[in-house]
Amino acid sequence: QLPPGKPEIFKCRSPNKETFTCWWRPGTDGGLPTNYSLTYHREGETLMHECPDYITGGPNSCHFGKQYTSMWRTYVMMVNATNQMGSSFSDELYVDVTYIVQPDPPLELTVEVKQPEDRKPYLWMKWSPPTLIDLKTGWFTLLYEIRLKPEKAAEWETHFAGQQTEFKILSLHPGQKYLVQVRCKPDHGYWSAWSPATFIQIPSDFIMNDEQKLISEEDLGGEQKLISEEDLHHHHHH
């Protein structure tokens, strides 16, 4: 029987800068029941606080609700593991909520094949930002990325969409069923998970063009830029 091993706080994430959760890995098992407690203080203060909510984030977690979350303040946190033989302490983790945002995936991804009479057909997609993110305040700039592939293909084709919530792509394989997904990230922070896949059947009469792909730079009404296949591969495939 031993004291518990040193725990490690390995991740903190916020969906929207209003709340956040941190998770730790327990240390090695000393062979006895072990209690974990997370304590924190705000940088520049000496008063230590205990985790307000050990439940919401699941096992080995601490959730900070709205009333405990401050923007523009750095949190300094540590996990203490204790059993009958003694205690161990994690390294301290410094957390600034601004830099740990991981939004929910974008919502309402709609995909359509557009076949205008006067232009080449294209795949058009549209989505909404995640509901928890308030874009009106200016606190957030969300960037989007789209990926698509034929249903049976192994490789995804990835496109960076910038801040726009609409996108169109030419040059798809006629007659194929495509999977399309979108994800987002704030300017400082982490990519969301991919949205659930949306399926779209490309008609057999869809005109294939291997030489170039048309990608909107702003919204659909804005300027459009012709990008060569080589440039596209360099800039947009991850």
Epitope: L2, P3, P4, G5, K6, E8, G27, T28, M78, G86, S87, S88, F89, S90, D91, E92
Partner: antibody, heavy 120, light 107 residues
Framework: EVQLVESGGGLVQPGRSLRLSCAAS????????MHWVRQAPGKGLEWVSG????????GYGDSVKGRFTISRDNAKKSLYLQMNSLRAEDTALYYC?????????????WGQGTLVTVSS | DIQMTQSPSTLSASVGDRVTITCRAS??????LAWYQQKPGKAPKVLIF???SLESGVPSRFSGSGSGTEFTLTISSLQPDDFATYYC?????????FGQGTKVEIK
């Protein structure tokens, strides 16, 4: 520049007491845990005791438990080791060492040591 | 307490040699292991922490690896300044323990 300077060592008879001090400079003392490590002549390193930044947790090696007491005075940037009931096997060079964090990590700075000799 | 066992106790080597020192822990210590170098009459100096992270200012010929119970310190090309005694230390538990040391001497 981080500096740790130990003092208080000397020749003492078995059963008697001695108090070691470590004066710290060049860093914010109360941002770090501190430790005492000893080395008997010609032998390896042995962790003696440690204390976290706010004195909220203290630990001792098995060979000194109940006889030695570690303490710190953050205002004076000083670490202490009160050694009671000294034995011949406590003869060693005693180093003051800084933990690299406030709680439990490796030792990133060491003093040059103060020699304690327990002999009749 | 967790026991740390180093091997070999003494190692004879020449300048330019690749040198490996092993440290075994009696219990799993994750990656919470540090390596120190000590020269005669001097205080120890940290080389490696968290099993494989090089302390700032330490030459890149020193490297550490391992996790769990088995760890190694490697000196890729031994320099004259490297003849010293090396200690491993676990900090998985608050009660720290050191290995007994490995003396690297000139062959």
């Amino acid at each position: 520049e981080v500096q740790l300077v130990e003092s208080g060592g000397g020749l003492v008879q078995p059963g008697r007491s001695l108090r070691l001090s470590c004066a710290a400079s060049g860093f914010t003392f109360d941002d770090y845990a501190m430790h005492w490590v000893r080395q008997a002549p010609g032998k390896g390193l042995e962790w003696v005791s440690g204390i976290i930044w706010n004195s909220g947790h203290i630990g001792y090696g098995d060979s000194v438990k109940g006889r030695f007491t570690i303490s710190r005075d953050n205002a004076k940037k000083s670490l202490y080791l009160q050694m009671n009931s000294l034995r011949a096997e406590d003869t060693a060079l005693y180093y003051c060492a800084r933990d690299s964090g406030r709680y439990q990590s490796y030792f990133d700075y060491w003093g040059q040591g103060t020699l304690v000799t327990v002999s009749s | 307490d967790i026991q740390m066992t180093q091997s070999p106790s003494t190692l004879s080597a020449s300048v330019g040699d690749r040198v490996t020192i092993t440290c075994r822990a009696s219990h799993i210590i994750s990656s919470w292991l540090a390596w120190y170098q000590q020269k005669p009459g001097k205080a120890p100096k940290v080389l490696i922490f968290k099993a494989s992270s090089l302390e700032s200012g330490v030459p890149s010929r020193f490297s550490g690896s391992g996790s769990g119970t088995e760890f190694t310190l490697t000196i890729s090309s031994l320099q004259p300044d490297d003849f010293a005694t090396y200690y491993c230390q676990q900090y998985n538990t608050y009660s720290r323990t050191f290995g007994q040391g490995t003396k690297v001497e000139i062959k």
